[in-house]
Interface confidence: medium
């Protein structure tokens, strides 16, 4: 059993990675029909991973701690936000000794409900179901659940069919504050204004592996390319720069966040939609000079160092956008606010 006593976010992330492995890897105890299917995690909009503390046999579970991550518009996972769980009832009442939980948030509205409110009650407006198990194909009729939330519980190392309806995920503000060294809301952590901490690399490694598994199973709908095209053509936040404790992370934080009503809205500079008519390919190549170094965040990004001269292939009217450029034979997109016109 994983330690459920609320601790710091670093150990929570480590614990979460361990739990997720236990829920998804085929072992002598977990046969191929006793794991969370890759596509469930690959398609999830959010994921909560917790361990639960129980006062004793036949006694209601008292609560638990863990983390939640959200899927960003570009397909990557957000930084982790610390959470607790309360109001555990259901199967717990009859003595099922649940140790670890994985909660799959299938829809954006489930993630947003938690991020905006700081807590999320399972059930009611958000339908909850025990999540499907096994390496079933995604199209399997039995798996076509419309539930907003899937729950996976383990009891004594085995899956237990407990839906967790009526229990509540709670934002742990103090844990987040201590880890991120600032007062920060779950919304800003989960919706991409916060860097993925290096301490959670284990967790991201296993999360990213599900996307690969899912794609390898022939279920790919070229999500990466679509995300990249969306990022180029629609309003989306620029990559930020280091904000707090850069030694903890190579990815940075952005301060200029905008409207919160829609995850895909332009988060850096609200109200800039009029700037986003594409100028398209340029007749005369424009050269820009990099003010700051930019390390690409995903394939298709253009890496450059401060001082590099980039040939712009296509641009918008706004400096607060992604442009396309060419450097040393490589073509890719880059944040225009990192460069200056020559």
């Amino acid at each position: 059993m994983n330690n459920p006593i609320p601790s710091n976010l670093k150990s929570e992330a480590k614990k979460a990675a361990k739990i997720l492995r236990e829920f998804t890897e085929i072992t002598s105890r977990n046969g191929p029909d006793k794991i969370i299917p890759a596509h469930v995690i690959a398609k999830a909009k959010g994921l909560a991973i917790l361990s639960v503390i129980k006062a004793g046999f036949l006694v209601t579970a008292r609560g638990g701690s863990g983390i939640v991550v959200a899927r960003l518009p570009d397909g990557k996972w957000s930084a982790p936000s610390a959470i607790g769980i309360a109001g555990l009832g259901g199967g717990f009442e009859i003595g099922i000794e649940v140790s670890d939980l994985v909660i799959i948030l299938n829809y954006d509205r489930a993630v947003e409900a938690f991020a905006k409110g700081g807590n999320l009650t399972l059930g009611g407006n958000l339908t909850v179901a025990v999540g499907p198990l096994g390496r079933n194909l995604e199209g399997n009729v039995a798996l076509r659940s419309s539930a907003a939330v899937f729950t996976y519980c383990k009891s004594r190392g085995l899956f237990a069919g407990v839906s967790l309806e009526g229990s509540c995920l709670i934002e742990r503000k103090e844990t987040n504050r201590k880890f991120y060294c600032q007062d920060i809301r779950a919304y800003d952590i989960l919706f991409g204004d916060t860097p993925r901490p290096a301490q959670a690399e284990d967790l991201y490694e296993i999360l990213d592996s599900f996307t690969e598994k899912y794609e390898n199973e022939g279920q790919r709908i070229n999500a990466r390319k679509a995300a990249r095209e969306q990022r180029k053509s629609s309003a989306k936040e620029l990559p930020p720069k280091p904000l707090s404790r850069p030694q903890q992370s190579s990815a940075p934080v952005q301060l200029n966040s905008g409207s919160q009503s829609n995850r895909n809205e332009y988060k850096l500079y609200p109200g800039l939609s009029s700037y986003h008519e594409r100028v398209g390919n340029l007749n005369q190549p424009i050269e820009v000079t990099a003010l700051y170094s930019f390390e690409g965040q995903q394939p298709g990004d253009l890496n450059f160092q401060a001082g590099d001269r980039i040939t712009v292939i296509s641009k918008t009217d706004s400096h607060f956008d992604w442009w396309e450029g060419k450097l040393r034979g490589q073509t890719g997109i880059f944040p225009a606010n990192y460069v200056t016109m020559n």
Epitope: D193, P242, S244
Partner: antibody
Amino acid sequence: EVQLVESGGGLVQPGGSLRLSCAASGFTFSNYAMSWVRQAPGKGLEWVSAISGSGSSTYYADSVKGRFTISRDNSKNTLYLQMNSLRAEDTAVYYCAKAEYSYLYFDIWGQGTLVTVSS
Amino acid sequence: DIQMTQSPSSLSASVGDRVTITCRASQSISNWLNWYQQKPGKAPKLLIYAASRLQSGVPSRFSGSGSGTDFTLTISSLQPEDFATYYCQQSYSSPWTFGQGTKVEIK
């Protein structure tokens, strides 16, 4: 013309409170993070607090954490700094500053407002 | 927190002199370094950003250089209006910190 005008400074007793305002004009206020920077008499510049464009994220220097609250009203193009439990060492000229391009630098500064904490 | 150390803390120079101010960061900050000028009773004014980029409207006699931990502000030919206090500031990580300032006085 891009302009920032601070107000609300004055004399206050230790333990007292004060609210500073910064009226912005000449740029789309909600698009930019804003910051407060202070300067004690005869001393250097010290960053105090910052707030994101939407107001959803706030940041504080350790010296003011828990006592000062930064906020903004984008409909009024105004930045605020609520200062509670004031101490003698908070005596300074307080400047508001506009942060350009993802907090790369402070490109526009107000003229400053003097806060004196003394009994 | 990243500490910024300027040297010298003050200097005396004459009009036409070449003046150099240095700023050292306690850890590498790449080129996330800005320079400000402040005159008595006035607000600071941005001179240089990204270590070497001249802010619009600032005379070309001001220049900046450096990367990593060591940075320099140079005034190629000191003018009467340049007598002021100069501050470096890192924008690499929060809290954003300033150097203690360098006062340039008339010799």
